[in-house]
């Protein structure tokens, strides 16, 4: 696993413990909370990052209308169960034996139940809509410049293959980034759109997961882009199953 050899740190995940105890004295990094070995040449899975976060001490419009099945992460933080590959287990339960099913980004997609609740498979989130509102600037951003900058960001910083950034929409002051990645499209070694979206969200919140970096401050052709608010919508390959009571 690639880690900075000189001082043995993980460039892509500051929530790790690293030591030169890998094969041949190579630097090896393990995620806090789970103790799982992580690959520091790419993004760490959201499940392992959430687990690490919970273990750490407290410190005609061009815009897309989210589908009726789009999920927003309203439940917030929880200590997830991750599988051996670092993915979310389809069923998550808390200490009081309340259980629910989640999608591949760890967002609840069913009503809460008890230990008898079954979650047959981990349903993939194949479409993520990141909705940003920016603060007033010297003028509207040029759409193509903004598009290029955000695509560059996801390619270079988050190592997400450009084909998974489906579109960048802009209607001042709202920016929308659409990420799409079907199960069939995701090859071995490809960064998951859910992981890229989570790193981006943490960057915008000034809680960068990258080693030695603060938050992410974007600029487009020199113009500072100050984000006012962020909303992320998740669309699953199979629509979520909530009772009518929740929908009303």
């Amino acid at each position: 696993h690639t880690a900075a050899q000189d001082n043995c740190t993980c460039p892509t995940n500051k929530m790790t413990v690293c030591s030169p105890d890998g094969p041949g004295g190579r630097c090896q990094c393990r995620a806090l909370g789970s103790g799982m070995a992580v690959d520091c040449s790419t993004l760490t899975s959201k499940c392992l990052l959430l687990k690490a976060r919970m273990s750490a001490p407290k410190n005609a419009r061009t815009l897309v209308r989210p589908s009726e099945h789009a999920l927003v992460d309203n439940d917030g933080l929880y200590d997830p169960d991750c599988d051996p590959e670092g993915r979310f287990k389809a069923r998550q339960c808390n200490q009081t034996s309340v259980c629910w099913c989640v999608n591949s980004v760890g967002v609840r997609r069913t009503d809460k139940g008890d230990l008898s609740l079954r979650c047959d498979e981990l349903v993939r989130t194949h479409h993520i809509l990141i909705d940003l509102r920016h603060r007033p600037t010297a003028g509207a951003f040029n759409h193509s410049d903004l598009d290029a900058e955000l695509r560059r960001l996801f390619r270079e910083r988050y190592r997400l293959h450009p084909k998974f950034v489906a579109a960048v929409h802009y209607e001042q002051p709202t920016i929308q980034i659409e990420l799409r990645q079907n199960t069939s499209q995701k090859a071995a070694g490809d960064v998951d759109i859910g992981d890229a979206a989570y790193y981006f969200e943490r960057d915008i919140k000034g809680e960068s997961l990258f080693q030695g970096r603060g938050g992410l401050d974007l600029r487009v052709r020199g113009e500072p882009l100050q984000v006012e608010r962020t909303l992320i919508y998740y669309l699953d390959e199979i629509p979520p199953k909530f009772s009518m009571k929740r929908l009303t």
């Epitope: 010297a138 000034g206 938050g215 401050d217 600029r219 052709r221 020199g222």
Partner: antibody
């Protein structure tokens, strides 16, 4: 290395205008905005506004809207600030500054231009 | 506008002392906080950005911490060249500075 060199001190009468310059070198001028910040004697630093040399777009602190005018000359890699209707409270050191390469903090500063407003 | 309140406004300390300066924002600034050092007659010098990231060439005795609305600059062992005025600045919503903390020799 990055350098911002500002014009010399000015003494002005109340009601007059002052125009000062900030010459940038050591980087591509159009890559970053130029901020203007002032500091009155014994006071905190106060952000006036910025200009984007790319397109001459400007953003101002509400307090200075209508009185401060920011311009730039790409060919000379120079930014300018003009402040009109001067009053004694405008006596201050005026700084230009360039943002940090990765954040919106201000990493490189000019040496400052002292403006004294006195009758 | 976001207001930045620094405390104390001044402090007296000796070489070798540990010095702590705090900065409180009127709302959450999501770690978009910088600390500057300013000496008389000079322009401010950026020490820390992103609340915790030390700028290149800044001695490791300087450190930044905090989140949300509350941030701290710590000088672990004050050196003679550290006597100056320190300012915090938020850059989450435009740019505003704290009123400064003057660190004087006791």
């Amino acid at each position: 290395q990055v350098q911002l060199v500002q014009s010399g001190a000015e003494v002005k009468k109340p009601g007059a205008s002052v125009k000062m310059s900030c010459k940038a070198s050591g980087y591509t001028f159009t890559t970053y905005v130029i901020h203007w910040v002032r500091q009155a004697p014994g006071q905190r630093l106060e952000w006036i506004g910025y200009i984007n040399p790319n397109n001459d777009g400007t953003k101002y602190n509400e307090k200075f809207k209508g009185r401060a005018t920011l311009t730039s000359d790409k060919s000379a890699s120079t930014a300018y600030m003009e402040l009109s209707s001067l009053r004694s409270e405008d006596t201050a050191v005026y700084y230009c500054a360039r943002p940090h390469f990765e954040t919106h903090a201000m990493d490189y500063w000019g040496q400052g231009t002292l403006v004294t407003v006195s009758s | 506008d976001i207001q930045m309140t620094q405390s104390p406004s001044s402090l007296s300390a000796s070489v070798g002392d540990r010095v702590t300066i705090t900065c409180k924002a009127s709302e959450d600034i999501f770690n978009r906080l910088a600390w500057y050092q300013q000496k008389p007659g000079k322009a401010p010098k950026l020490l820390i950005s992103g609340a915790t990231s030390l700028e290149t060439g800044v001695p490791s005795r300087f450190s930044g911490s905090g989140s949300g609305k509350d941030y701290t600059l710590t000088i672990s062992s004050l050196q003679p060249e550290d006597f100056a005025t320190y300012y915090c600045q938020q850059y989450w919503n435009t740019w505003t500075f704290g009123q400064g903390t003057k660190v004087e020799i006791k």
